[in-house]
């Protein structure tokens, strides 16, 4: 595949990455799948600077990111190491809360209205952000 040199239409470029901000809501798994079909992934926040950028674009709205602990440990969807990486949880979060009564705890992370992170039920239909790296080879065949 060829290396992507500019962002697709309706995507926002920032620091060698492209971001797409949804205006509708989906469950975390559906949002994850949507991004994958776009040859991207749910946003992975690696710095305070990136956090501020995303926060500015989503506003005070619950929005899924690419972080979950459905398989045990917290994991970023692109393999970025959770333990050594940037974190911005709300105070007392994550808490794997069971009080929602929907079954199970809370395994998916989202931006809250103030931008800080919370874990929530993965089935909730929140907005989401896709990210893809400009330096990444695209899946499209090169133009001859």
């Amino acid at each position: 595949g060829s290396e992507r040199t500019c962002c697709p239409v309706n995507w926002v470029e920032h620091e060698r990455s492209c971001y797409w901000f949804s205006r509708s809501g989906k469950a975390w798994a559906d949002a994850d799948n949507y991004c994958r079909l776009e040859d991207a992934h749910l946003v992975v926040v690696t710095s305070w600077e990136e956090q501020k950028f995303v926060q500015h674009h989503i506003g005070p709205v619950n929005t899924w990111m690419g972080l979950h602990d459905q398989n045990g440990p917290w994991k970023w969807v692109d393999g970025t190491d959770y333990e050594t990486g940037f974190k911005n949880w709300r105070p007392e979060q994550p808490d794997d809360w069971y009080g929602h009564g929907l079954g199970g705890g809370e395994d998916c992370a989202h931006f809250t209205d103030d931008g800080r992170w919370n874990d929530d039920v993965c089935q909730r239909p929140y907005r989401w952000v896709c990210e893809t790296e400009l330096d990444k080879a695209s899946q499209e065949p090169p133009l001859l």
């Epitope: 602990d69 459905q70 045990g72 440990p73 917290w74 959770y82 333990e83 974190k87 949880w89 105070p91 007392e92 979060q93 994550p94 808490d95 794997d96 069971y98 009564g101 079954g103 199970g104 705890g105």
Partner: antibody, heavy 115, light 107 residues
């Protein structure tokens, strides 16, 4: 690698209290709850409750309410489970586990209650 | 509280056998059923979470299935190290509860 290391075996008299520690390493202590499970000799597993290391919030099984206290010291990534008013039926191995779906467990602490 | 009934409580089998253990919940627990293996004198180890997901490092001869109230753990080809005790656990609602255990013994 993720490890939960528990304190050593204890022998207590009926009516006394015991405090078991569980030191976590290899992960961010505040990102996962700590659960306590006990097992009497030759018996099954019995969940006692959970603690959120971030907030200190806890949830106890009704059977242990009023006798159990779960606490933590985040500066040393250690969780504690204290059980008071001990009786002979409390003789068991006590385990700490990470998450309610216990993906990692401590090695267990044998608490013997005997006069 | 949700009760879990595991059956059988013990079974005898031989190396190479296919073994199935069942776990029945007193109410629907969706997919929130986990299986543990416990060796004598050791802490339990998570085998399968959320009904059918194999925990990292667990051999593929272990599998889980089911939904709602009825669940099964299958060991496709018993190995010598598999002759230990197995527990189911529900993490659908608090308090978390365990089944009574199934001891797999050598015939």
């Amino acid at each position: 690698q993720v490890q939960l290391v528990q304190s050593g075996a204890e022998v207590k008299k009926p009516g006394a209290s015991v405090k078991v520690s569980c030191k976590a390493s290899g992960y961010t202590f505040t990102s996962y709850d700590i659960n306590w499970v006990r097992q009497a000799t030759g018996q099954g597993l019995e969940w006692m409750g959970w603690m959120n290391p971030n907030s200190g919030n806890t949830g106890y099984v009704q059977k242990f309410q009023g006798r159990v206290t779960m606490t933590r010291n985040t500066s040393i990534s250690t969780a504690y489970m204290e059980l008071s008013s001990l009786r002979s039926e409390d003789t068991a191995v006590y385990y700490c586990a990470r998450k309610k779906t216990g993906d990692y467990w401590g090695q267990g602490t044998l608490v013997t209650v005997s006069s | 509280d949700i009760q879990l009934t595991q059956s059988p409580s013990s079974l005898s089998a031989s190396v190479g056998d296919r073994v199935t253990i069942t776990c029945r919940a007193s109410q629907s627990i969706s997919k929130y059923l986990n299986w543990y293996q416990q060796k004598p004198g050791k802490a339990p180890e998570l085998l399968i979470y959320a009904t059918s997901n194999l925990q990292s490092g667990v051999p593929s001869r272990f599998s889980g299935s089911g939904s709602g109230t009825d669940f099964t753990l299958t060991i496709s080809t018993l190995q010598p190290e598999d002759f230990v005790t197995y527990y189911c656990q529900q993490s659908y609602s608090l308090p978390v509860t365990f089944g009574g255990g199934t001891k797999v013994e050598i015939k």
